[in-house]
Interface confidence: low
């Protein structure tokens, strides 16, 4: 349906309060090193101006496509040139190359430093002084930090964080209130955030193929009882809504995924059981209920899969008819049996499918050839199950800081042109799928965990891609999203790396490291062990673990002697140099 | 739909060069990994090279590196494969394809749209 004016369309349809805090995301992500109060001023005036053209259509450029109205907001910001170089070339440009080349410059690693919560009787002041400007500058510094952030999901996030302080800002202790419940929810805007970089780049590095195929296998294991024809419609939508999303369009994408919402509430007895609870709720919080809601119960007269799929005699003439539509039938079929693979996994197996049909198509007799195809997933299915358990064994004989170090020695081992700021976060990114998957029971631990290290890969090959220095990166990113786990797990030591110079200065520690919080402190030491590893990558284990060890008793002494820094200047170079003697 | 037609085949000596050309029509060129495949007579079809849509990532036979580049134009859908140094192994019927979503670029069966082919035939 064509709207007179798209803006004024968009404004009734989200209501004022979403509509100004999707603008003021929108320009947070496209322009990150604005301050808060050009950002406030610019998502002001445009939804001042969405409200006039929604009380009169056909006012002055009331008319104009979002991207003309955003685009010429953003070319009025002064400061462009100086703060963003190239980027103020944009503005030369036309639509849609205009908002192409903005999407372009959106900078996945910023640099900001993490933000600090001032003390609490400041926040609550400032909270209870002011709750639309605090909520907006939650707003903007979660979207100028994640570029890619779900712009609906941080709407309802900031409906969270002012819950929080409503409640704490009452409490007799504040920052005991407030400590855990922040931290709680800051855990889950980075994984979040982290969940949506996937999606965008699935949508954006592989097609809407790629991102359809996840979907349906990912919602055919929550609602199982749905048809395919159910799911195929949903997976169409939230195809479109992500691709909305990810390509900077948060309006359309706020107000789809709202009605996409509204289309699974009223059609909840062909999808889910499970979803009453979630329709009750208001906008946010239904489309943010629907996301998370639990897996409904497998039918119980289902089929084998071999009689559509093996032995079938019209198998290949299926196939080939509609070749899509029935491997989009497999994939349903396949994982709604299956709840306990992976996505990923689900995906290979439909992989693996398609390549057996195309083979035995073509043979003179295809039955034969694909007879057993089912059963030669075995070996894809014994893979990451054989991962997950090897694994998690080695997490729960390390804890959560050893088995981040000893993720950290292999991938520091298989990619050591990787930067070590990247390969330290993304390692203490993987590490952590130990404390998130290993203590669920087996039936969930390796979808949990495979799906979880899709998304902190793709964290790596983000970051990669901005500044590539490793062919077999570059490899593993690129050639298959279903199989950039496997790809990065079958890395071996990359014998062509020629070992990095001996730098005195990153191996130089001050005083000032007995100060800082448990997490930083484990940072800095796993950051001198990447070093270590670059500049002697054929140190073994037990070497490393004796260095490592030597290092973690250096700083307690230090960090409690009278004469700290004094400590950390003398006993430091010994302790390098018995390292280098240690990993001759 | 997409519509792929190559160009540029022909008889060569070894050592000769040849630039093949595929234009694109149907569809948004930008958007698909293109790939040249060949096959000789009597044997199977085999890739040869892929690019992916924004020309970052190309991919190449072991038989063919270094003697072969793959480019695309996307302003004018048109993906090349530029053939130096060629030998009498190389003579085959040289492909286009086009693909929405690849897992892996070197499987022909990826590939969702091919051209018709152009001939190469290397000879003395």
């Known amino acids: 349906e064509a709207y007179k004016s798209e803006i004024a369309h968009r404004y009734n349809d989200l209501g004022e309060e979403h509509f100004r805090g999707l603008v003021l995301v929108a320009f947070s992500q496209y322009l990150q090193q604005c301050p808060f109060e050009d950002h406030v001023k610019l998502a002001k005036e445009v939804t001042e101006f969405a409200k006039a053209c929604a009380a009169e259509e056909s006012g002055a450029n009331c008319d104009k496509s979002l991207h003309t109205l955003f685009g010429d907001k953003l070319c009025t910001v002064a400061s462009l040139r100086d703060k963003y170089g190239d980027m103020a070339d944009c503005c030369e440009k036309q639509e849609p190359d205009r908002n192409e080349c903005f999407l372009a410059h959106k900078d996945d690693n910023p640099g900001f430093p993490p933000l600090v919560a001032p003390e609490p009787d400041a926040l609550c002041a400032a909270f209870q002084d002011n709750e639309q400007l605090f909520l907006g500058k939650y707003l903007y510094e979660i979207a100028r930090r994640h570029p890619y952030f779900y712009a609906p999901e941080l709407l309802y996030y900031a409906q969270q964080y002012k819950g929080v302080f409503a409640e704490c800002c009452q409490a007799a202790d504040k920052a005991a209130c407030l400590g855990p419940k922040i931290e709680a929810l800051r855990e889950k805007v980075l994984l979040s955030s982290a969940k949506e970089r996937f999606k965008c780049a699935s949508l954006q590095k592989f097609g809407d193929r790629a991102f359809k195929a996840w979907s349906v296998a990912r919602l055919s294991q929550r609602f199982p009882k749905a048809d395919f024809a159910e799911i195929s419609k949903v997976v169409t939508d939230l195809t479109k809504v992500h691709k909305e999303c990810c390509h900077g369009d948060l309006l359309e994408c706020a107000d789809d995924r709202a009605d996409l919402a509204k289309y699974m509430c009223e059609n909840q007895d062909s999808i889910s059981t499970k979803l009453k609870e979630c329709c009750d709720k208001p906008v946010l919080e239904k489309s943010q209920c629907l996301a998370e809601v639990e897996r409904d119960e497998l039918p119980g007269d289902l089929p084998s899969l071999a009689a559509d799929f093996v032995e079938d005699k019209e198998v290949c003439k299926n196939y080939q008819e509609a070749k899509d539509v029935f491997l989009g039938t497999f994939l349903y079929e396949y994982a709604r049996r299956h709840p306990e693979y992976s996505v990923s996994l689900l995906l290979r197996l439909a992989k693996e499918y398609e390549a057996t049909l195309e083979k035995c198509c073509a043979t003179d007799d295809p039955p034969t050839c694909y007879a057993k195809v089912l059963d030669e997933f075995k070996p894809l299915v014994d893979e990451p199950q054989n991962l997950v358990k090897t694994n998690c064994e080695l997490f729960e004989k390390l804890g959560e800081y050893g088995f981040q170090n000893a993720l950290l020695v292999r991938y520091t081992k298989k990619a050591p042109q990787v930067s070590t700021p990247t390969l330290v976060e993304v390692s203490r990114k993987l590490g952590k799928v130990g404390t998130k998957c290993c203590k669920k029971p087996e039936s969930e631990r390796m979808s949990c965990a495979e799906d979880f290290l899709s998304v902190v890969l793709n964290r790596l090959c983000v970051l990669h891609e901005k500044t590539p220095v490793s062919e077999r990166v570059t490899k593993c990113c690129s050639e298959s999203l279903v199989n950039r786990r496997p790809c990065f797990s079958g890395l071996e030591v990359d014998e062509t790396y020629v070992p990095k110079e001996f730098n005195a200065e990153t191996f130089t520690f001050h005083a000032d490291l007995c100060t800082l919080p448990e997490a930083e402190k484990q940072v800095k030491k796993q950051t001198a062990l990447v070093e270590l590893l670059k500049h002697k990558p054929k140190a073994t284990d037990e070497q490393l673990k004796t260095v490592m060890g030597d290092f973690g008793a250096f700083v307690e002494k230090c960090c409690a002697a009278e004469n700290k820094e004094g400590c950390f200047s003398e006993e430091g170079p010994k302790l390098v140099a018995a390292a280098q003697a240690a990993l001759v | 739909e997409v519509q792929l037609v190559e160009s540029g085949g022909g008889v060569v000596q070894p050592g000769d060069s040849l630039r093949l050309s595929c234009a694109a029509s149907?569809?948004?060129?930008?958007?698909?990994?293109m790939g040249w495949f060949r096959q000789a007579p009597g044997k199977e079809r085999e890739f040869v090279s892929a690019?992916?849509?924004?020309?970052?990532?190309?991919y190449y036979a072991n038989s063919v590196k270094g003697r072969f580049t793959i480019s695309r134009d996307n302003s004018k859908n048109t993906v090349y494969l530029q053939l130096n140094s060629l030998r009498p192994e190389d003579t085959a019927l040289y492909y286009c394809?086009?693909?929405?979503?690849?897992?892996?670029?070197?499987?022909?069966?990826?590939?969702?749209?091919w051209g018709q082919g152009t001939l190469v035939t290397v000879s003395s």
């Open positions: 149907g569809g948004t060129f930008s958007t698909y990994v």
């Open positions: 690019i992916s849509q924004n020309s970052i990532h190309t």
């Open positions: 394809a086009a693909s929405r979503f690849t897992s892996w670029y070197t499987a022909d069966y990826e590939y969702d749209y």
